[in-house]
């Protein structure tokens, strides 16, 4: 539940470039806020295998963000 951690960015370092879609249970997008001045894409893996930060500049992250934002407006 990354959304409940407050006061700092959640991702340390650049993050991974890609995660296999078949391994992804869900994803969260954290938009810039007072807590963190950058966008973060957090992947939750299937089978309780934890979470990964996706590099927001990666092709996969940009695709996710683009699809989400296109649907919103």
């Amino acid at each position: 539940f990354p959304m409940f951690k407050r006061g700092r960015c959640l991702c340390i370092g650049p993050g991974v470039k890609a995660v296999k879609v078949a391994d992804i249970e869900k994803a969260s997008i954290m938009y810039p806020s007072n807590n963190c001045d950058k966008i973060e894409v957090i992947i939750t893996l299937k089978e309780n295998k934890g979470q990964r930060c996706l590099n927001p500049k990666s092709k996969q992250a940009r695709l996710i963000i683009k699809k989400v934002e296109r649907k919103n407006f």
Partner: nanobody, 120 residues
Framework: EVQLVESGGGLVQPGGSLRLSCAAS????????MGWFRQAPGKQRELVAS???????IYADSVKGRFTISGDNAKNTVYLQMNSLKPEDTAVYYC??????????????WGQGTQVTVSS
């Protein structure tokens, strides 16, 4: 950015009732699941109830028979009717949604939380 807007929290006496609501800020979304979690001071977050598209409705054992979750697809809204409230139901209640954008996995969203306090 989709936002989940919660309302309905407050102070209620033991045995009383409250109805929480949570609405997604945009229409036309494909919502896989919506639900409620709660977190009491010093405790871990726990699932209260969840409703899925075409799937089962899930309740925590501690609220079965007292709480009822329902959804309004047209309004992208989920409700939690809480009856026979107990002091141990006191917590911050968070709305959660899993939205399908055709990526092969859903995007998860959380509300900001609404406080429910059960006390005499």
């Amino acid at each position: 950015e989709v936002q989940l807007v919660e309302s309905g929290g407050g102070l209620v006496q033991p045995g009383g009732s409250l109805r929480l609501s949570c609405a997604a800020s945009r229409s036309g979304l494909s919502i896989n699941a919506m639900g409620w979690f709660r977190q009491a001071p010093g405790k871990q977050r726990e699932l209260v109830a969840s409703i899925t598209r075409g799937g089962p409705t899930i309740y925590a054992d501690s609220v079965k028979g007292r709480f009822t979750i329902s959804g309004d697809n047209a309004k992208n809204t989920v409700y939690l009717q809480m009856n026979s409230l107990k002091p141990e139901d006191t917590a911050v209640y968070y709305c959660n949604a899993l939205i399908d954008y055709g990526l092969g996995f859903p995007i998860e969203y959380w509300g900001q939380g609404t406080q429910v306090t059960v006390s005499s």
